[in-house]
């Protein structure tokens, strides 16, 4: 997260570090006891590595009494994610068994009504994605709040040039951004998760090149059946 | 397929005002700003201004910023340009042309100011 | 306003020639530059866009390149089809401007 601060501990407790081999990669979000929403590139990242889901953190490092890190039972990429395109850029991992939730684990309300947010909106997205152009890692959860920007303005040739869809929105990222290690955190609007981090390389803090989050609720059949 | 399709042409007398449409399909209308551009007759190419169908905010070349007035009906669809107290020097091929992604421009409408 | 100024205004070629048209903006404008090509009685068609990237569909002979304030668009091997005029545009700052086009004749 560029330009944000460090969230209030366990405020957001739907919050979910997708791992590596114990290491960082991404973000996620929990949306029902046993599964977290994250972002299909993250899987490509991975490798072969063990993928963990850890839920109930502020500290990434430091022990906490409400982390824990569950395995992956199944990850399941969005059938039309590809690797070349954001297009579709939504993943479930299915836990090895239900969380324990309690006040700093619990899942979040996504929405299901395919509505777009309105422009000027502000949402909040979390991460413990880098903190600087210089790539400095925070060890504790980072927000922002961003303003939503209509997709007109997000596809002019100055901005994302004609590549964001119906099923993706826009938030502004003058200075303030979601950024690398973001990737399959939740952008909250009203308390309702909107929209998931898209991964990609896109340049961070640049105010013509926005923030791009995949819309949930534009995908609520396909979250529906794989939570089925 | 994407499609933007213009207006007849039109013979206005000086003082007139035009309104030249532009209907888009193929596409989310208001995902995209809509630009126009005009032509006189062997010259180059000129912007005149644009318009989010989504918001409705405009941009005007300040050349044009008092006589032109850009609108759209998302209903439809459709993006309009009209110019008012024309003159002769008006006289222009009008383009509507789709800001971001591939450069979709509609055929023209040629727009003749005389007495 | 930002001035585009391109040369030549015009030039004659032959079939296989490379053919090399400059833009020069007024002021910086990044990459955020187009080029149109344009036939008589049609609507421009793009070819270029962000100074390099060339739009589906445009055979691989044109190519641009430049940043900041100089731009150029090259044609590899000048085809039949390709006689027409070229437009350059900038749409880094309000107003969007064109460059006055530059024409491609037979020789």
């Known amino acids: 997260i560029l330009g944000g601060r460090e969230a209030e501990a366990h405020a957001r407790p739907y919050m979910a570090s997708v791992q590596v081999n114990g290491e960082h990669l991404c973000g996620g979000v929990l949306v029902a006891e046993q599964w977290v929403l994250s972002a299909a590139h993250c899987l490509e990242d991975a490798a072969d590595g063990k993928v963990q889901v850890l839920l109930g953190a502020h500290s990434l490092s430091q022990p906490e009494p409400s982390k824990r890190l569950y395995d992956v039972l199944r990850a399941v990429p969005h059938p039309d994610s590809r690797p070349d395109t954001i297009d579709h850029d939504l993943l479930l991992l299915q836990l090895s068994e239900k969380a324990t939730l309690g006040p700093a684990v619990r899942p979040l309300p996504w929405q299901r009504v395919d509505r777009d947010v309105e422009p000027g909106t502000l949402c909040d997205v979390a991460g413990w994605g880098i903190v600087s152009h210089a790539g400095r890692r925070p060890d504790r959860l980072q927000h922002v709040l961003l303003p939503v920007l209509d997709r007109a303005t997000c596809n002019r040739r100055t901005h994302h040039d004609g590549a964001i869809t119906q099923r993706m929105m826009c938030a502004e990222s003058n200075r303030r951004d979601s950024c690398k290690g973001d990737s399959g955190g939740p952008l909250v609007c009203g308390g309702v998760l909107e929209g998931v981090v898209t991964s990609g390389s896109r340049v961070c803090g640049n105010r013509k090149k926005p923030g791009i989050y995949t819309r949930v609720a534009s995908y609520a059949a396909w979250i529906d059946s794989v939570l089925a | 397929e994407v499609q933007l399709v213009q207006s007849g042409a039109e013979v206005k007398k000086p003082g007139a005002s035009v309104k030249v449409s532009c209907k888009a399909s193929?596409?989310?209308?208001?995902?995209?700003?809509m630009y126009w551009v005009r032509q006189a007759p062997g010259q180059g190419l000129e912007w005149i201004g644009e318009?989010?169908?989504?918001?409705?905010?405009?941009n005007f070349n300040e050349k044009f910023k008092s006589r032109a007035t850009l609108t759209v009906d998302t209903s439809t669809s459709t993006a309009y340009l009209e110019l008012s107290s024309l003159r002769s020097e008006d006289t222009a091929v009008y383009y509507c042309?789709?800001?971001?992604?591939?450069?979709?421009w509609g055929q023209g409408t040629l727009v003749t100011v005389s007495s | 306003d930002i001035q585009m100024t391109q040369s030549p205004s015009s030039l004659s070629a032959s079939v296989g020639d490379r053919v090399t048209i400059t833009c020069k903006a007024s002021?910086?404008?990044?990459?955020?530059v187009a080029w149109f090509q344009q036939k008589p009685g049609k609507a421009p068609k793009g070819l270029i866009r962000?100074?390099?990237s060339r739009y589906s569909g445009v055979p691989s002979r044109f190519s641009g390149s430049g940043s900041g304030t100089d731009f150029t668009l090259t044609i590899s091997s000048l085809q039949p089809e390709d006689f027409a005029t070229y437009y350059c545009q900038q749409y880094n700052n309000y107003p969007l401007t064109f460059g006055q086009g530059t024409k491609v004749e037979i020789k």
């Open positions: 318009i989010n169908p989504y918001s409705g905010d405009t």
């Open positions: 002021q910086n404008v990044d990459t955020d």
């Open positions: 042309a789709r800001e971001g992604g591939f450069a979709y």
């Open positions: 193929g596409y989310t209308f208001t995902s995209y700003y």
């Open positions: 962000s100074a390099s």
